[in-house]
């Protein structure tokens, strides 16, 4: 069985790193497993990782907007960013804005690895299920 | 063969859902139908999903831009969002403006489904081969 | 083995195209070859290419922005624009700016196809290994 | 910057019909609708259709459907609306907008062209 | 066709004031993405001019004190404080389908 996960936005995310619906609407979860926020790999292989996360506020103050894609391996003593998105001065002071950041790209990964999405905003981040997710799947 | 497609801007089109070159320049159409504006699935399974679409206008206003792909199925009474990007307060007043939006994702996607892209503003998209797109791929 | 590339930014680059990091940190590279900043394709087929470019100033003058994957062949005598964003008018004049573009989709490429990223203007891009980077991978 | 430069006032007889021009520029004609709206002396707004320069494509108001005619020239980037059957109450100034496709506001108007029916 | 009325048909304010016009469609012009509703000025011998657009975005070059607001069948258009230059007729449109409409206006004059 292909090796494949898409979760969505979970708007009761309250802390770091952001936690997913895994179970309902069009979330996938086949042949990797979710844990605490985190996808967990359980064959070494290469995967292609990606996330989007959409951002909006009601009052624009420019606050920088960070959007991190990292790994986490016990082997390992610190976190691996492996992708990661900045915005500053991105809206116009005072306006209602709104806007996205999507990352793409291709890992080795190895067996009993975590992987996590980090922002620097929780309270800017919306949870719809189309605008906000994680994913990866094995090539 | 790959199921795979890998459409571009089509720049005398003024419907909605988007239309879309399929057979002149980069196009690929391989294993997938298209049918007026849509991706036609015809065969079951796992596919990643994207689209970029590159907005621009002549003197910024900030009008609210929305860019989607959305599935219709006979079966089901109502399109369903799979992604989306928005964007607000994004230009300088009064300035000549440019922006992408891009959206991927993996979905589970069953014979018959049509595939669809959506803007809320069809006057702001440039339709360069390069910079607006709709594609996918059976994993 | 499977065809794959992943290249990190290369913070001496100097000149267009783009030059990569193909040897420290989370590169890959295999079955592909990398050469003076290309992707250097060996075998016909369908590929998923994907760029993301990190730009980022002191002081925004909102100088536009271009981040460009193209292909050359010898066969050709032209450049061939794969994918291309733009960006016009996105940040607060004199402030402190950051902002990512992403790019990708499939191609079918052809042995002997060299695959470069190109940037209007390198001064303001960031060649962290997480924030800009260049890939792709044979379906 | 946008313009858009409507043809003089007319005075025609009832019975026979106008043609109203406006030229476009300072934008790519082929990506906006243009819309013609018009208003009666001292009266309101009254949309009468648009027309999309990219393909030719148009819709009316019923109001006009079978009267109203418009067109385009993209090699001159212009647009026209022809009204026949003339009445005393299409005594009215006619404007052209530019309309943007899926938000239908008029963004950018012309001047306006008066257009007098009377025997 | 969706029906637009305006109230009131003259506003009496004097300048500085505040001054609140409402427009009432016949049926929704609001969908989970947006309001189909806009709002022009205009003037004696000229034409329109667009001041809002999707019920409460500020079209470029308008000032700040011109602010719109509501949704589904109901909306205003708010002037903060007004200015001897905004005295004129304002009329609200739809673009939810065709076709498009106009309220019949409601004219701003000085008290």
């Known amino acids: 069985l292909r090796k494949v996960a898409h979760l969505t936005g979970k708007s009761n995310s309250r802390s770091m790193p952001l936690e997913w619906e895994d179970t309902y609407g069009i979330v996938l979860l086949s042949g990797v497993k979710y844990k605490k926020g985190g996808l967990v790999i359980n064959e070494t292989g290469l995967y292609f990782v990606y996330s989007k996360v959409y951002f909006r506020g009601q009052s624009c103050n420019n606050l920088p907007l960070s959007h991190k894609v990292y790994m986490r391996n016990s082997k390992y003593p610190q976190d691996l960013v492996m992708m990661e998105g900045k915005m500053m001065s991105y809206c116009t002071t005072g306006q209602m804005w709104a806007r996205s950041s999507y990352l793409g790209a291709v890992f080795n990964l190895t067996s009993a690895d975590h992987l996590y999405v980090n922002v620097s905003e929780l309270s800017l981040v919306n949870f719809e299920e189309s605008q906000t997710f994680f994913g990866l799947y094995k090539l | 063969l790959r199921k795979v497609a890998h459409l571009t801007g089509k720049s005398n089109s003024r419907s909605m859902p988007l239309e879309w070159e399929d057979t002149y320049g980069i196009v690929l159409l391989s294993g997938v139908k298209y049918k007026k504006g849509g991706l036609v699935i015809n065969e079951t399974g796992l596919y990643f999903v994207y689209s970029k679409v590159y907005f621009r206008g002549q003197s910024c206003n900030n009008l609210p831009l929305s860019h989607k792909v959305y599935m219709r199925n006979s079966k089901y009474p109502q399109d369903l969002v799979m992604m989306e990007g928005k964007m607000m307060s994004y230009c300088t007043t009064g300035q000549m403006w440019a922006r992408s939006s891009y959206l991927g994702a993996v979905f589970n996607l069953t014979s018959a489904d049509h595939l669809y892209v959506n803007v809320s503003e069809l006057s702001l998209v440039n339709f360069e081969e390069s910079q607006t797109f709709f594609g996918l791929y059976k994993l | 083995l499977r065809k794959v590339a992943h290249l990190t930014g290369k913070s001496n680059s100097r000149s267009m195209p783009l030059e990569w990091e193909d040897t420290y940190g989370i590169v890959l590279l295999s079955g592909v070859k990398y050469k003076k900043g290309g992707l250097v394709i060996n075998e016909t087929g369908l590929y998923f290419v994907y760029s993301k470019v990190y730009f980022r100033g002191q002081s925004c003058n909102n100088l536009p922005l271009s981040h460009k994957v193209y292909m050359r062949n010898s066969k050709y005598p032209q450049d061939l624009v794969m994918m291309e964003g733009k960006m016009m008018s996105y940040c607060t004049t004199g402030q402190m700016w950051a902002r990512s573009s992403y790019l990708g989709a499939v191609f079918n490429l052809t042995s002997a196809d060299h695959l470069y990223v190109n940037v209007s203007e390198l001064s303001l891009v960031n060649f962290e290994e997480s924030q800009t980077f260049f890939g792709l991978y044979k379906l | 910057q946008v313009q858009l430069v409507q043809s003089g006032a007319e005075v025609k007889k009832p019975g026979s019909s106008v043609k109203v021009s406006c030229k476009a520029s300072?934008?790519?004609?082929?990506?906006?609708?243009i819309s013609w709206v018009r208003q009666a002396p001292g009266q309101g707004l009254e949309w009468m259709g648009w027309?999309?320069?990219?393909?030719?494509?148009?819709q009316y108001n019923e109001n006009f459907k079978g009267r109203a005619t418009l067109t385009t020239d993209k090699s001159t980037s212009t647009a026209y609306m022809e009204l026949s059957s003339l009445r005393s109450e299409d005594t009215a100034v006619y404007f052209c907008?530019?309309?943007?496709?899926?938000?239908?506001?008029?963004?950018?108007w012309g001047q306006g062209t008066l257009v007098t029916v009377s025997s | 066709e969706i029906v637009m009325t305006q109230s009131p048909a003259t506003l009496s304010v004097s300048p500085g004031e505040r001054a609140t016009l409402s427009c009432r469609a016949s049926?929704?012009?609001?969908?989970?993405?947006?309001?189909?509703i806009h709002w022009y000025q205009q003037k004696p011998g000229q034409p329109p001019r667009l001041l809002i657009f999707?019920?409460?975005h500020l079209e470029s070059g308008i000032p700040a004190r011109f602010s719109g607001s509501g949704s589904g069948t109901e909306f205003t258009l708010t002037i903060s404080s007004l200015q001897s230059e905004d005295f004129a007729v304002y009329y609200c449109?739809?673009?939810?389908?065709?076709?498009?409409?106009f309220g019949q206006g409601t004219k701003v004059e000085i008290k």
């Open positions: 907008a530019r309309s943007l496709i899926s938000t239908a506001m008029f963004d950018h």
């Open positions: 300072g934008y790519t004609f082929t990506r906006f609708d």
């Open positions: 027309i999309f320069p990219g393909d030719g494509s148009s």
């Open positions: 049926k929704s012009v609001s969908t989970s993405d947006f309001s189909y």
């Open positions: 999707l019920a409460s």
């Open positions: 449109q739809h673009s939810r389908e065709l076709p498009r409409t």
